[in-house]
Structure formats: structure tokens, C-alpha cells
């Protein structure tokens, strides 16, 4: 009764506003779309985020929230505003009914509305636990900074803050945006309310279990006690957090997302920026056994996505589902039967599964080097985690076969020491989504605001591709991947690197006319190669029998295909210095290798030749990796020669200021 | 700034009960428990249990357990331990502390059993 | 009978260097990062000097110091003042409860 009573308040006034003449004209051209969670289960109809464009002040969303009520109530709809945005995304949040869609797409300053959707908490067993005392000899592990500089907010279930692990670690806040719980017949035990997020915070910050001991936490209650929450409520908590950031700036924050969602262009949009604002945002892969692409926030660049691994470093099996994986997943990190602290009562342990467990440990370890150095952005932070992770441990048999080549085989580990890894030129491998079969179709990838785009490749399973380029898109190079007719699609590689002060441009060379092929190098003084790329326009490059090997005394200089344009990255940077190391094989062989020697970074992979029956170049950490077809089905023994070309840098510049800070 | 007040000076005969208060200011309530530690006359410290604020959950020491009962009242912020059965060798100082990490301390209750 | 032992009392001259020792189990020292010292001066209720084996609290004395290696504690205290003299107890986290030692009588000669 009070609800309907509240509804029919704010729809008097909502008429009074149109009567008042706040109504503004329609805007033309942009179409604001409409977006609904691809599972169907986990959809809220009825209930619907309305995203305004993002110059909207936070008047103009009250205005066109009312707008909106006075429009519906017209058509004799009852509408009812639940929350306005601000802080973080324009917006509202309304509760109307379905048909009144089409009205809103059509307001003023709406770019895009999408109906809310359910959020999981991602662990199992989270609520049949086994209590169990700390199996470990505590002293084994006392890091000598546990995180006391950063402040980690965890939005997940409520807690018990007084458990003996966490007691005086955890603030609870006063946000709580929960569903109801399903079922009539739920019994709302406390114990089994407060078990996710209490496991979580002891993982995180626990005495004797956490990973980063000295870390002071605030919880946020955004899962219900079946650990279930919305994406609306996850955005409401997302926003309180900007708001107290604005309101009373700390230190460094890490934020915790240990549920997930279906891919939610809402919830991954108030993930970048957030993380744009400078807070440090990991979550969940997701407990689904399927690409981690297709669910929020784990689909956001911008956030840490980690995956989970069991001691023996492979990846977690969840009865019959298990992590998630593929190229939105950063890292994985330890999963399966992680013991923290347990709300059945204030000095029980319990152990639980799940990417939740392992997203909790990365941000632990983020809290721990965010500590020892709290001036790091979250693009270097990412970068030194996926360093110091231990490489190529996971069996990746475990995944399905097309998702193998995407799935970073990094498990993550506490830095030998918090400090002193400055000097490193720090380089990851970034994936773009498949770019479909059409004939015309491409991929691009990207790299972080605050990282430099040094080389570009480019895969396709089928091998039929029109290779890569590098390209400026909103003043920043991307790398974009051509697919070929007959195609299934290509893969973008970009390689993403920390880079301060460098300038770096892209020198293009169009086919030869020539027979010996296509060059092209860095003619600017102080630029050095970091990385080649091909591209070509016909549909199959023909085999290239002259020798393409880079003569003498020519390191920065880019060869390929004649028939192809060749693009060199050329990078000035203090102390940079890069070289080119080939491994060339004569015989026909599915995959070539080189490798940097230690203290260098590969910042360049590519193939040479560049003909058809290369499927394409990619880094995995400091190995360049060429792929061509099966031997079996290649032709003749010249086609199959391939040289996997890696370009390998370092920069004295970081080294000697390192030095200077020790 | 965190204090815990205690409740003043008890004297009790053997067999009675004995109910002290523990008033606490300064700190967000449900992030620590209290805890409840003796001392008697010359001797150590014992722990005797702990209540949390938060959901009214309690763990008691074995060596009391089934004569104390711990409560609180969230409304005034205070905590109560409450012993029956009392013996001669109860007597000692009894004190609040919080949580289990005992940080702060109350200024103690001295219960006498005498007859 | 303290589940955790402590030497009866210990003594040092002004300005030089005590430790005291806390001896348990791996259930309870050993097996937890969680032992705390306190200092207790007669008629006082005790004041927390060390947590978390190695902790600080604000404004407690730089003098002050815990270790661990194994199942024993230690606390340290350096440049002995005469307001140092006072009883000290250890505790530490059981599987379920909490243990103190039987205390220690510092005394500065």
C-alpha cells in the first residue's frame, strides 16, 4: 500500500514538472539503444537502468526522469524513479513497465538503456561449509608489508566484522542494495548471510589466513544471503565509493567484485571509469566454464579479471562448471579449497572454491604492492602482476581448444620483493575479440590509456587473413586485424607496454614493385624498432622466395611480402634500445619460437614471409610465437620455411633511475 | 577516544550470581566483540569469553562454561557477564576488554565471594 | 597450570636489553600469527604492547619489540627504563579460545 501511495506521489508531481514547462525538445540523430542481459534467467524486466549521455548534469537527469514519469502517466503508466545517478554515470534507475521503452529511447540526452539483471556471488560451497582449523604453519608466511597503506572495499554479502581473523580490519559501511531473497519458504540464517563476504575479507586482509595482513577493508552489501544481487545495486555501491573518494581522499583503493553477472555494458562502463578515477578494480572470472567475455565485470579491460588454479596450478573444476577463462581473463590465482575466516562462529575456518577466493587473492596482493609503492597506476600495477606471476604452469588442456591461444597461462604471485622492480620495461600481450568471417571484417585491440602501443599482430585459425596494421583511433594507435574472404575471422594482438616519456609513430612502406620484397625502417634520430606489421590487400599472399632475412647493420628495419604494405613502429624514449633476434626454420614446422635472453622484453612478434600458410604471430610473455598450418597440408618444403622475428628492448633510462632509488 | 566502563566493586556469598556491565564508547560497535578476562588475587590472567556485538554470538572458556552467560544491549552499548554459582575462587578482578585482540582494556570490577 | 609458559620474573639494569620468553604448542603459538604482550603495573589493568607477534600500537615506545620462531615468542625490550618495571604476559590465539601465560615480574635494578 505504502509503495502504491509513493507511486502515485511521484506521479502527481511528475505532471506537475510537464506542467511547469521543464520538458525539453527532443534530440535527433544519435538513436539510444536498448540492451537486455543474454541470459535469460538472470533478466529483471521491469526494472531498467536509462544512461544518459555523458555531459549530462545531474538537473538534466532529474528532469528527464520526470519527463519521463509525466509522459508514461499520460499513457496511464505508473512509473517510480528508484535512485539518480551522479559520481560516476549520468543516469536513473526506474521501475515502469516494458512498453514504455520505446518513449524513453526517445528522451532527451538518453544514449542507451539497459533493463537490470541478476549478479552472483562466485564461490561454491559458499553456503555448506566445512569447518576446519588453518592447515599451515602461520610463520611460513609474514610478508614485510601487508597492505597497511590501501584500503580495500569489498562488495559482496554482509559480514561478520567481529570474526577473531578480521575484527578491527573491516569497517562495514551503511550501504545495503540487496534483492529478495527467492522462495517463500527462505529462512534467513545469519550465519549463512554473512558466510561469502567473511571468507572473502579474511582471504583478503585475514590474520592468519589473509594475504595482505595489514589491509584495512570496507564492506558494501550488495548480495543478498543467497548471494544474489542486481546490477543496479553493484552500480549504487559503485557510485558510493566515487562519492566517498571525492569526499575524503586516501590512499590508494582497491575495489573487490567477487560476483558476476551477464556482460552488462552498464556495469563494465561504471567499471572504466571508476578505474579512470585511479582505483584499482578486481573481479571474478566467473564460476561458468566459459569464456570470461561473456560476463560482467569480468568483461571490462579496465578491471583485474582473475581467473582460479588449485594447488597444483590448473584450472578449478566447479562440479560440473569450473573458471571461466579466454582473453578477458588477466591472471588466475590460487581457488580450490582456499580456508578463510567462517561466520558460523568467530574463530571457525572454513574453506571455500571459487574465482571469488582467487580474485581476493590478487587483490591482496595488489594491496600489498600498492602499499610498498602507492604512487603506481593501475596499468603498472597490472603490468607487475602479471610479471611476477609464475608462466606456463596451467595444463590448458583443461580448456576448449579455441580458447587455448587466448588464455594467459599466468598464475598470480607475491613480488620476490615489494620493491626495486622500476628498471623492468614491463610488456603484456592484449587479445582482441574475434573479428567474425566476413569477408571485410576486423578486429582491434587495444591497449590502456597510460601504456604504449609497441607492435601489432595478427591470427586466424584458418590462416586466411590480410594481416595487421597499426592505426591512430582517437589520438591513441590501436592495432586492427583484416580478415580474408573465405575466413573465419582474425585475432588483433596488440602488445601493451609501460613506457614513460616515449614517442612513438608508425613509418608505412606500400607494396614493392619490386621482387625482394617490402622494407621499412625507423629514419627519425633517437627512434628505435619495437615492432613490424604486414598488411596486404589480395586474398592469398603468394609464396616469396627471395631472401627476406634483414641484411647487416640494419636493425631497425622492417622486411615482408612485396605484395604487402609493411609498418614499423618507431619509438623514442630515454635509454630505449631494441634489437631484432630471428629464428628461422627450414623445414615445414607448426609452431617457430624465439625468445629474449633475460633482462630484455619483447615488444615485437611477427612472421616472415608473410604468405598464407602463417596463421599468424602472437607473444606469450617473453616468447614470440609463429603458427603456420599443419605440415600435412602445406605444399611444398620452401612454403613451409618460417622465421619467427622477435624485437627485443630494454631501457637503461629505468635501470639507471632504479639504481638511483636504492 | 575507545573506552570500556565497568560497573563498581562486588561483594557476593558463595552460590550467588554476580552481574557485571561493560559500557563501550568511541569505536564502530560491531567490528570487535568483547572479551571478558579475570585476575585473581597475585595470580595471572584467564580468559573467560567473548560476545560479539555485532549478532549476539558468544564463545565461552571450558573451564566456565555452563556458569556464565555474556549478553549485550545494543541500545545503551553495553556488554554484561553474568556468573552464577559463585565460589571463593572466584574472587578476582574482572575486566573488558576489546575484542580478541584485547586492545583496550576497562578499569576492572573487583568481585569478592566471601561468606 | 598457564597454557603458555613464561619465566617467572626476569631483571635488567637501566639501559640495557630484557627478553622475555613465551613458550606454547603449534595450537596455539606456533600455529597463529595472533600473540599479544601486555604490561600490567600494579593496581592497572593491563595495556597492550605487542600484537600480531611483531605490532606496535600507537603510541607505544620504539623500545618495545616481539619476534617468533616456532612455538616461542619473545618480547624485547631495549634501553631499560625504570617505568619499564611491571608484570608481562603473552597471549595467543587458540583453535577457540585465547591463552595467556603465567606472567613475568620485570624488574630494573
Known amino acids: 500500500q505504502e509503495d502504491e501511495d509513493g507511486d502515485y506521489e511521484e506521479l502527481v508531481l511528475a505532471l506537475r514538472s510537464e506542467e511547469d514547462g521543464l520538458a525539453e525538445a527532443p534530440e535527433h540523430g544519435t538513436t539510444a539503444t536498448f540492451h537486455r542481459c543474454a541470459k535469460d534467467p538472470w533478466r529483471l524486466p521491469g526494472t531498467y537502468v536509462v544512461v544518459l549521455k555523458e555531459e549530462t548534469h545531474l538537473s538534466q537527469s532529474e528532469r528527464t526522469a520526470r519527463r519521463l514519469q509525466a509522459q508514461a502517466a499520460r499513457r496511464g503508466y505508473l512509473t517510480k524513479i528508484l535512485h539518480v545517478f551522479h559520481g560516476l554515470l549520468p543516469g536513473f534507475l526506474v521501475k515502469m513497465s516494458g512498453d514504455l521503452l520505446e518513449l524513453a529511447l526517445k528522451l532527451p540526452h538518453v544514449d542507451y538503456i539497459e533493463e537490470d539483471s541478476s549478479v552472483f556471488a562466485q564461490s561454491i560451497p559458499w553456503n555448506l561449509e566445512r569447518i576446519t582449523p588453518p592447515r599451515y604453519r602461520a610463520d611460513e608466511y609474514q610478508p614485510p608489508d601487508g597492505g597497511s597503506l590501501v584500503e580495500v572495499y569489498l562488495l559482496d554479502t554482509s559480514i561478520q566484522s567481529d570474526h577473531r581473523e578480521i575484527e578491527g580490519r573491516v569497517m562495514v559501511t551503511d550501504f545495503e542494495n540487496v534483492p529478495e531473497e527467492d522462495g517463500t519458504r527462505f529462512h534467513r540464517q545469519a550465519s549463512k548471510c554473512d558466510s561469502h563476504g567473511t571468507h572473502l575479507a579474511g582471504v583478503v586482509s585475514g590474520r592468519d589466513a589473509g594475504v595482505a595482513k595489514g589491509a584495512s577493508m570496507r564492506s558494501l552489501r550488495v548480495l543478498n544471503c543467497q548471494g544474489k544481487g542486481t546490477v543496479s545495486g553493484t552500480l549504487i555501491g559503485l557510485e558510493f565509493i566515487r562519492k566517498s573518494q571525492l569526499v575524503q581522499p586516501v590512499g590508494p583503493l582497491v575495489v573487490l567484485l567477487p560476483l558476476a553477472g551477464g556482460y552488462s555494458r552498464v556495469l563494465n562502463a561504471a567499471c572504466q571509469r571508476l578505474a579512470r578515477a585511479g582505483v584499482v578494480l578486481v573481479t571474478a572470472a566467473g564460476n561458468f566454464r566459459d569464456d570470461a567475455c561473456l560476463y560482467s565485470p569480468a568483461s571490462a579491460p579496465e578491471v583485474i579479471t582473475v581467473g582460479a588454479t588449485n594447488a597444483q596450478d590448473q584450472p578449478v573444476t566447479l562440479g560440473t562448471l569450473g573458471t571461466n577463462f579466454g582473453r578477458c581473463v588477466d591472471l588466475f590465482a590460487p581457488g580450490e579449497d582456499i580456508i578463510g575466516a567462517s561466520s558460523d562462529c568467530s574463530t571457525c575456518f572454513v574453506s571455500q572454491s571459487g574465482t571469488s577466493q582467487a580474485a581476493a587473492h590478487v587483490a591482496g596482493i595488489a594491496a600489498m604492492m600498492l602499499s610498498a609503492e602507492p604512487e603506481l597506476t593501475l596499468a603498472e600495477l597490472r603490468q607487475r602482476l602479471i610479471h611476477f606471476s609464475a608462466k606456463d604452469v596451467i595444463n590448458e588442456a583443461w580448456f576448449p581448444e579455441d580458447q587455448r591461444v587466448l588464455t594467459p597461462n599466468l598464475v598470480a604471485a607475491l613480488p620476490p620483493s615489494t620493491h626495486g622492480a622500476g628498471w623492468q620495461l614491463f610488456c603484456r600481450t592484449v587479445w582482441s575479440a574475434h573479428s567474425g568471417p566476413t569477408r571485410m571484417a576486423t578486429a582491434v585491440a587495444r591497449c590502456a590509456p597510460d601504456e604504449e602501443l609497441l607492435s601489432c599482430s595478427s591470427f586466424s585459425r584458418s590462416g586466411k587473413r590480410r594481416g595487421e596494421r597499426m592505426e591512430a583511433q582517437g589520438g591513441k594507435l590501436v592495432c586492427r586485424a583484416h580478415n580474408a574472404f573465405g575466413g573465419e575471422g582474425v585475432y588483433a594482438i596488440a602488445r601493451c607496454c609501460l613506457l614513460p616519456q616515449a614517442n612513438c609513430s608508425v613509418h608505412t612502406a606500400p607494396p614493392a614493385e619490386a621482387s625482394m620484397g617490402t622494407r621499412v625502417h625507423c629514419h627519425q634520430q633517437g627512434h628505435v624498432l619495437t615492432g613490424c606489421s604486414s598488411h596486404w590487400e589480395v586474398e592469398d599472399l603468394g609464396t616469396h622466395k627471395p631472401p627476406v632475412l634483414r641484411p647487416r647493420g640494419q636493425p631497425n628495419q622492417c622486411v615482408g611480402h612485396r605484395e604487402a604494405s609493411i609498418h614499423a613502429s618507431c619509438c623514442h624514449a630515454p635509454g630505449l634500445e631494441c634489437k631484432v633476434k630471428e629464428h628461422g626454420i627450414p623445414a615445414p614446422q607448426e609452431q617457430v619460437t624465439v625468445a629474449c635472453e633475460e633482462g630484455w622484453t619483447l615488444t615485437g612478434c611477427s612472421a616472415l614471409p608473410g604468405t598464407s600458410h602463417v596463421l599468424g604471430a602472437y607473444a606469450v610473455d617473453n616468447t614470440c610465437v609463429v603458427r603456420s598450418r599443419d605440415v600435412s597440408t602445406t605444399g611444398s618444403t620452401s612454403e613451409g620455411a618460417v622465421t619467427a622475428v622477435a624485437i627485443c628492448c630494454r631501457s637503461r633510462h629505468l635501470a639507471q633511475a632504479s639504481q638511483e632509488l636504492q | 577516544q575507545v573506552q570500556l566502563v565497568q560497573s563498581g566493586a562486588e561483594v557476593k556469598k558463595p552460590g550467588a550470581s554476580v552481574k557485571v556491565s561493560c559500557k563501550a564508547s568511541?569505536?564502530?560497535?560491531?567490528?570487535?566483540?568483547i572479551s571478558w578476562v579475570r585476575q585473581a588475587p597475585g595470580q595471572g590472567l584467564e580468559w573467560m569469553g567473548w560476545?560479539?556485538?555485532?549478532?549476539?554470538?558468544?564463545n565461552y572458556a571450558q573451564k566456565v562454561q555452563g556458569r556464565v552467560t555474556m549478553t549485550t544491549d545494543t541500545s545503551t552499548s553495553t556488554v554484561y557477564m553474568e556468573l552464577r554459582s559463585l565460589r571463593s575462587d572466584d574472587t578476582a578482578v574482572y575486566y573488558c576488554?576489546?575484542?580478541?585482540?584485547?586492545?583496550?582494556w576497562g578499569q576492572g570490577t573487583t568481585v569478592t565471594v566471601s561468606s | 597450570q598457564s597454557a603458555l609458559t613464561q619465566p617467572a620474573s626476569v631483571s635488567g639494569s637501566p639501559g640495557q636489553s630484557i627478553t622475555i620468553s613465551c613458550t606454547g604448542t603449534?595450537?596455539?603459538?606456533?600455529?597463529?600469527?595472533?600473540v599479544s604482550w601486555y604490561q600490567q603495573h600494579p593496581g592497572k589493568p593491563p595495556k597492550l604492547m605487542i600484537y600480531?607477534?611483531?605490532n606496535r600500537p600507537s603510541g607505544v615506545s620504539i623500545r618495545f619489540s616481539g619476534s617468533k620462531s616456532g612455538n616461542t615468542a619473545s618480547l624485547t625490550i631495549s634501553g631499560l627504563q625504570a617505568e619499564d618495571e611491571a608484570d608481562y604476559f603473552c597471549?595467543?590465539?587458540?583453535?577457540?579460545?585465547?591463552?595467556f601465560g603465567g606472567g613475568t615480574k620485570l624488574t630494573v635494578l
Open positions: 600480531e607477534v611483531s
Open positions: 568511541g569505536y564502530t560497535l560491531t567490528s570487535y566483540g
Open positions: 603449534s595450537s596455539d603459538v606456533g600455529g597463529y600469527n595472533s
Open positions: 576488554a576489546r575484542g580478541y585482540g584485547m586492545d583496550v
Open positions: 597471549s595467543s590465539y587458540t583453535s577457540t579460545s585465547m591463552v
Open positions: 560476545i560479539s556485538f555485532y549478532n549476539g554470538n558468544t
